[in-house]
Amino acid sequence: HNTTVFQGVEGQSLQVSCPYDSMKHWGRRKAWCRQLGEKGPCQRVVSTHNLWLLSFLRRRNGSTAITDDTLGGTLTITLRNLQPHDAGFYQCQSLHGSEADTLRKVLVEVLADPLDHRDAGDLWVPGESESFEDAHVEHSISRSLLEGEIPFPPTS
């Protein structure tokens, strides 16, 4: 799986979309999980409605909400009031029994609020490949890593 980078501004909302084949994943609930490190386990944050037919209903866990357009094949996750600790690796998953298929690997980056004047010296605008070696930038909101590409970043 490629990794798609979504950038959001601290204090604002960030919407992450995960497209999928609606026929292949027909009848399956979806989930959003947080990965502990690039190779670490993925901890469930929130999942869609227990009844698949009601997957369009928004479900929330804290500041994270999930909704699934099962006909269009798009899972949407909203992170409200984005904070630095929300940054990291996540996965969109399709659930079947106790198994989970990865729909998309996501890296969430939290940018400093340009309107926050508490410490103007700390203002950070990332360079095009400051975080990722030769990463492709898709107009500020998301970009994809090439197959097998290692984030440059990626401790603990």
């Epitope: 600790h85 950070w124 603990s156």
Partner: antibody, heavy 120, light 107 residues
């Protein structure tokens, strides 16, 4: 028991090479990144480089690029760090370190360290 | 490379004291900062990951805070076994870089 066991101390002449091994037990190295960190006597920690044993891909700090080679043998769950063209300032304890990568790894294992002394 | 600057480089404190060590990154590193403790002749031990998360088995007297460029490690009540050298390390980008270390000595 989860641990990283490193090879024993080495004494080398300037210009020579040294190869330090790091064997994992209790876990599979493919599930981790293996880093090498060194510490000169009385000095701080210095990150040298890293390997993803699953992909066979490695990265190096610019200072060690071209002089250090990090490899891994997944069949024996062992990682290696070879440093060439040794100089006296390479005298240090070399540690291997396993984690799940950047962005919040909760796993963190270290070898016991290998003292490499470079002296004529 | 991202430079990590720790202060102070050393400090003397007594058992029971509250100790604070700071770490400054030359670039924004979000929360991708770890704190390690190292005792003479031993490998480093992870205390805090992701700026404020306590590693498994680490006593709750240790805490971390900060994001962006400025981070703090606090020991709320220093214990005899806490006398050691502490390092911060950034995990935002490679090469990973460490602070120069802060040695906590007995007063």
């Amino acid at each position: 028991q989860v641990q990283l066991v490193q090879s024993g101390a080495e004494v080398k002449k300037p210009g020579a090479s040294v190869k330090v091994s790091c064997k994992a037990s209790g876990f599979s190295i493919e599930d981790f990144y293996i880093h090498w960190v060194r510490q000169a006597p009385g000095q701080g920690l210095e990150w040298m480089g890293w390997i993803d044993p699953e992909q066979g891909e490695s990265k190096y700090a610019p200072k060690f690029q071209g002089r250090a080679t990090i490899t891994a043998d997944t069949s024996t769950s062992t990682a290696y760090m070879e440093l060439s063209s040794l100089r006296s300032e390479d005298t240090a304890v070399y540690y291997c370190h396993a984690d799940h990568g950047n962005y919040g790894s909760t796993m963190d294992y270290w070898g016991q360290g290998t003292l490499v002394t470079v002296s004529s | 490379d991202i430079q990590m600057t720790q202060s102070p480089s050393s400090l003397s404190a007594s058992v029971g004291d509250r100790v604070t060590i700071t770490c400054h990154a030359s670039q924004h590193i979000n929360v991708w900062l770890s704190w390690y403790q190292q005792k003479p002749g031993k490998a480093p031990k992870l205390l805090i990951y992701k700026a404020s998360n306590l590693h498994t088995g680490v006593p709750s007297r240790f805490s971390g805070s900060g994001s962006g460029t400025d981070f703090t490690l606090t020991i709320s009540s220093l214990q005899p076994e806490d006398f050691a050298t502490y390092y911060c390390q950034q995990g935002q980008t490679y090469p990973r870089t460490f602070g120069q270390g802060t040695k906590v000595e007995i007063k």
